[in-house]
């Protein structure tokens, strides 16, 4: 058993049918010695008396808010949560496996640049009685500071019969140098509590590996005289690290017909312009990627050919 | 890949070209190592990230772009700062800093070259003959060093009398390649920046 926060405790259980569970001793936080009784949640049934209460915690029915009273007055509370260990592996019931970039990916994180700011998000089908708390650091043995905000519900989607909820959090490394070569990964730890179930999820990454630039901005077409060709030009996104000559991007320019079946023409360039043939009803899209370290491509920025 | 739009300084341009070749070569070598050594811990998540140049060179600091010298987090391990009375830099100081930066890159390359050659000698003794260093990568290191055109005393190749532990050697190869790729990215950024300046 360990303390998650004041008056909230997590009991770790080896979870299998007929498991013996864990013996837990609760102590009433009071100078009083006599006339103390204990109850669980809203029930008025007295579970025991005395300054300490010993319970065998086996299942969720044994978890909850234990309260000690004296003469109708509440003295203190202890909330017991359960953390299930199933055959040596901590349960992952609360969050959905996003399966990207690999199986067992519960937390996904992205950064728009090298400033040390990043966003993580996760999915769940649970809509109520759900709380998250996020901590982060650079390295684990001698951790350096990363400050995270509160997790917020960022999107709701309908997936088949189920509703899916996306939560996200923004974090910022306290003293980040965009040019630094990372040798210690960023660690992100999410505590999830659903009703009386506790779970924790972690992700470990280097900022360089989670970079996904914003799409190029100011995408414009300039027709070339007496030609079906157009000059496409664009700019680096505002959110990208500066100077751009140091933090360079490379670009992919795509000409896509109206029909998804039509052949796509693609050009790769390090410049911020390109000359392409603009077909009728086609659209031109441009996306960006770090020129020197191949992390994710940005989303496409698009303009119609007409 | 197309080269940046800025008209390259004829002195810098060969270095930019060689640094791009270097990054391509080390990335290919790392990919090959990850595939060949699939039963070894060779992914970024599995290895310890060690920098053999730590405390010996200071490439990131010496080559920091002017624009980042205002960022205190970038300066905490710098002995020499670009900032002089808040005014523009004197060209002598700029060229001094650039020389410091390029010599630091040269020293990095020299250290990695020695490590890779020592390691290759060990790998050639492996009866499994599982992996060797790409000669192209070693050649590209050499080319960039020549283009940088610094003279410094040659570091003797390390020789070891004891029987090599091939498992440890292959894991060390992965660690070295990961670190060298990261340094190659920095070198490429620096060359691109200097080329545009």
């Amino acid at each position: 058993i360990w303390e998650l926060k004041k008056d909230v405790y997590v009991v770790e259980l080896d979870w299998y049918p007929d498991a013996p569970g864990e013996m837990v001793v609760l102590t009433c936080d009071t100078p009083e010695e006599d006339g103390i009784t204990w109850t669980l949640d809203q029930s008025s049934e007295v579970l025991g008396s005395g300054k300490t209460l010993t319970i065998q915690v086996k299942e969720f029915g044994d978890a909850g808010q234990y309260t000690c009273h004296k003469g109708g007055e509440v003295l203190s509370h202890s909330l017991l949560l359960l953390h299930k260990k199933e055959d040596g592996i901590w349960s992952t019931d609360i969050l959905k496996d996003q399966k990207e970039p690999k199986n067992k990916t519960f937390l996904r994180c992205e950064a728009k640049n090298y400033s040390g700011r990043f966003t993580c998000w996760w999915l769940t089908t649970i809509s109520t009685d759900l709380t998250f708390s996020v901590k982060s650091s650079r390295g684990s043995s001698d951790p350096q500071g990363v400050t995270c905000g509160a997790a917020t519900l960022s999107a709701e989607r309908v997936r088949g019969d189920n509703k899916e909820y996306e939560y996200s959090v923004e974090c910022q490394e306290d003293s980040a140098c965009p040019a630094a070569e990372e040798s210690l990964p960023i660690e992100v730890m999410v505590d999830a509590v659903h009703k009386l179930k506790y779970e924790n999820y972690t992700s470990s990454f280097f900022i360089r590996d989670i970079i996904k630039p914003d799409p190029p901005k100011n995408l414009q077409l300039k027709p070339l005289k007496n030609s079906r060709q157009v000059e496409v030009s664009w700019e680096y996104p505002d959110t990208w690290s500066t100077p751009h000559s140091y933090f360079s991007l490379t670009f992919c320019v795509q000409v896509q017909g109206k029909s998804k079946r039509e052949k796509k023409d693609r050009v790769f360039t390090d410049k911020t312009s390109a000359t392409v043939i603009c077909r009728k009803n086609a659209s031109i899209s441009v996306r960006a990627q770090d020129r020197y370290y191949s992390s994710s491509w940005s989303e496409w920025a698009s303009v119609p050919c007409s | 890949r197309n080269l940046p739009v800025a008209t390259p300084d004829p002195g810098m341009f060969p270095c930019l070209h060689h640094s791009q070749n270097l990054l391509r070569a080390v990335s290919n070598m790392l990919q090959k190592a990850r595939q060949t050594l699939e039963f070894y811990p060779c992914t970024s998540e599995e290895i310890d990230h060690e920098d053999i140049t730590k405390d010996k060179t200071s490439t990131v600091e010496a080559c920091l772009p002017l624009e980042l010298t205002k960022n205190e987090s970038c300066l905490n391990s710098r002995e020499t700062s670009f900032i002089t009375n808040g005014s523009c830099l004197a060209s002598r100081k700029t060229s001094f800093m650039m020389a410091l930066c390029l010599s630091s890159i040269y020293e990095d390359l020299k250290m990695y070259q020695v490590e890779f050659k020592t390691m290759n000698a060990k790998l050639l003794m492996d009866p499994k003959r599982q992996i060797f260093l790409d000669q192209n990568m070693l050649a590209v290191i050499d080319e960039l060093m020549q283009a940088l055109n610094f003279n410094s005393e040659t570091v003797p190749q390390k020789s070891s009398l004891e029987e090599p532990d091939f498992y440890k050697t292959k894991i060390k190869l992965c660690i070295l390649l990961h670190a060298f790729r990261i340094r190659a990215v920095t070198i490429d950024r620096v060359m691109s920046y200097l080329n545009a300046s």
Epitope: D14, P17, D18, E59, K85, D87, I89, D93, K102 | -
Partner: antibody
Framework: QVQLVQSGGGVVQPGRSLRLSCAAS????????MHWVRQAPGKGLEWVAF????????YYADSVKGRFTISRDNSKNTLYLQMKSLRAEDTAVYYC????????WGQGTMVTVSS | SYVLTQPPSVSGTPGQRVTISCSGG????????VKWYQQLPGTAPKLLIY???QRPSGVPDRFSGSKSGTSASLAITGVQAEDEADYYC????????????FGTGTKVTVLG
Amino acid sequence: QVQLVQSGGGVVQPGRSLRLSCAASGFTFSSYGMHWVRQAPGKGLEWVAFIRYDGSNKYYADSVKGRFTISRDNSKNTLYLQMKSLRAEDTAVYYCKTHGSHDNWGQGTMVTVSS
Amino acid sequence: SYVLTQPPSVSGTPGQRVTISCSGGRSNIGSNTVKWYQQLPGTAPKLLIYANDQRPSGVPDRFSGSKSGTSASLAITGVQAEDEADYYCQSYDRGTHPALLFGTGTKVTVLG
């Protein structure tokens, strides 16, 4: 004490269907994940499928994906394996089993796919 | 498609020490715990060892398990006639959990 009693096995022709059941008692069935494991005659153990305690997630071996469906009825304390498009290579003893460091197995039920 | 490899058979005379190996990889045994099962002819498997080296109550102490790196082993010290059975190791793969990964199985024969 924990008990898993299986039923539903038998002889079936290739291409036909069969449903296996596994009735649980002696524990809170709705709190635990459950597996199906099979063993072809004279061969080793092969995992078939898993279902979460609440039925929210199901996982299948590639060899049965799209043909077999694992399900549970927590109000009836019963686990099921619906097997469709059966093939000769599905001939095996099928076991249900609880998920956890200490597990309990059903007695097994024989499924023979033969024309 | 077994990823955990066991020797097909091992044998010993009563009282001898018999060991069975189970070889896997970094993503399974290297990252997860190992169980061992005993299966007597015509019966369901019986758990002998869980969490690499833990014995459930009721399992004789002549059975012991261990794990090192990407392989595990089961030892029977002082093998007895009633130990003649098939033995299976089991683990998970970190990418496919909760799918059970079973070893190829080992037939233990007690001679004499």
